[in-house]
Amino acid sequence: KVILDKYYFLCGQPLHFIPRKQLCDGELDCPLGEDEEHCVKSFPEGPAVAVRLSKDRSTLQVLDSATGNWFSACFDNFTEALAETACRQMGYSSKPTFRAVEIGPDQDLDVVEITENSQELRMRNSSGPCLSGSLVSLHCLACGKSLKTPRVVGVEEASVDSWPWQVSIQYDKQHVCGGSILDPHWVLTAAHCFRKHTDVFNWKVRAGSDKLGSFPSLAVAKIIIIEFNPMYPKDNDIALMKLQFPLTFSGTVRPICLPFFDEELTPATPLWIIGWGFTKQNGGKMSDILLQASVQVIDSTRCNADDAYQGEVTEKMMCAGIPEGGVDTCQGDSGGPLMYQSDQWHVVGIVSWGYGCGGPSTPGVYTKVSAYLNWIYNVWKAEL
């Protein structure tokens, strides 16, 4: 049975086996085509999601589709139902929390009262002044909180208490990539993790431990990548894995927050990386223990210089490392999070690529998550 499952796939009507390598090869080998059904699927970028959250206290902003202008949501008459609608527009299914926060002196958007129409937030037509003088601070999911705060050092062994969103993504029980829990159903990782194996069946997610071999595996329902753009072939290294059954959150299994749309991190901002990847470039084997390291944002212009990546780092990528080199993500860390801590932990990057590991002028290159928020929300909405 195990041998059969490993090397063969069972077609239905009529029942017969085909070699597993014929799964997801673009050819219909089963009469009903089920060999091409459970494969990595691509999903387009989709329309602009008309709500977003700002790094200014997670305040809600709403798009006026007629003019293309964004407005801040006034707290006047804002209800739980409106909060749920806003979060559903971003693809969340959990119960949101919201509160009033004072309109700040730097408020640069017009403030409008919000209503609902066809399960979408709209600006109230006769919107007068914002009488409460407050904006809506909205949280769609409790995220980014861990039991333990890491110490700021170079590289050290990590505890799952510090990084409860970290998962191991495995194919045929072998660790391939890292990933981050975003909500009970979804894990964020890199698209390039699935380049070799595009069938969903053999992929599993392991959550809740800092040791590679010691935690139960979770079945995967879907793997979704963004549509390939041939004009920018290195962009879009992002994937979402939908779990077959929702996770039960605990001290060691928790989600990390997505970044705010306006999360612009300046050079030298401290960040964290974690993973079970190689500890030496071409270093032969994965680490059994989860490792963590503090790094910092490296200016993209510097990263693109001719003694570094020579213009290969696009606007949808970011660089992180330490100026003198020596601390970096490596093979096996791919798909894992690049993290920033404000009030909560945010996944600002996904481990993507780099030349070697830990070189001084070639730091790690990460998928910039804020560039893909719209895509993430559209995927989630389609799967609600």
Epitope: P230, D235, T301, G311, E312
Partner: antibody
Framework: EVQLLESGGGLVQPGGSLRLSCAAS????????MHWVRQAPGKGLEWLAV????????HYADSVKGRFTISRDNSKNTLYLQMNSLRAEDTAVYYC??????????????WGQGTLVTVSS | DIQMTQSPSSLSASVGDRVTITCRAS??????LAWYQQKPGKAPKLLIY???NLQSGVPSRFSGSGSGTDFTLTISSLQPEDFATYYC?????????FGGGTKVEIK
């Protein structure tokens, strides 16, 4: 060393057609988007068209949209520009150009030596 | 389309002079700007990209600065081989657009 060699220019009458070629060497042609840029005598540079590494996506300047077609043959390491309905104002030196990065096409770092197209009756 | 306005259109300078050429974009382009040098009868040559990065092989007397809409190319000490026409190009979005050029002539 990167080399881009344009050919196919010459004298053509208004309304006529011409096909320019650009033979590329010294880099992995099939990994890079490619451009055509022109320069009218004594004037500045005008970007015309770009094609993705696999030929599936093309963008054109408004001035040539519907008249010019950019294409490529990766097996021959060659870029083409098919120019139809030519006008006097299309008279220029035509350059084939390579982007600096394979990850994005918007920055050009190598240019061919150019081929002169003259549209005149 | 993004318009690129270069100034001056021409300038006269002597060997050893410090020369500054400016380029203004009609809308913000972050640091997506390149500078090219072109000599008569030759193809353009990339000098600066990402507004400030020096292309390898280009002498360090060339430097770029700016972000958003206003950019500058500076030649700290003009050499005889620097007499040429200089173009800026926005690399922010298609269609790619170039400035009108600045011709640097011998005084």
């Amino acid at each position: 060393e990167v080399q881009l060699l344009e050919s196919g220019g010459g004298l053509v009458q208004p309304g006529g057609s011409l096909r320019l070629s650009c033979a590329a060497s010294g880099f992995t042609f099939s990994s890079y988007a490619m451009h055509w840029v022109r320069q009218a005598p004594g004037k500045g540079l005008e970007w015309l068209a770009v094609i993705s590494f696999d030929g599936s996506i093309r963008h054109y300047a408004d001035s040539v949209k519907g008249r010019f077609t950019i294409s490529r043959d990766n097996s021959k390491n060659t870029l083409y520009l098919q120019m139809n309905s030519l006008r006097a104002e299309d008279t220029a030196v035509y350059y084939c150009a390579k982007p600096k990065a394979s990850s994005g096409p918007r920055l050009i770092d190598y240019w061919g030596q150019g081929t002169l197209v003259t549209v005149s009756s | 389309d993004i318009q690129m306005t270069q100034s001056p259109s021409s300038l006269s300078a002597s060997v050893g002079d410090r020369v500054t050429i400016t380029c203004r974009a009609s809308q913000g382009i972050s640091n997506s700007l390149a500078w090219y040098q072109q000599k008569p009868g030759k193809a353009p040559k990339l000098l600066i990209y990402s507004a400030v990065n020096l292309q390898s092989g280009v002498p360090s007397r060339f430097s770029g600065s700016g972000s958003g809409t206003d950019f500058t190319l500076t030649i700290s000490s003009l050499q005889p081989e620097d007499f040429a026409t200089y173009y800026c190009q926005q690399a922010n979005s298609f269609p790619l657009t170039f400035g009108g050029g600045t011709k640097v002539e011998i005084k």
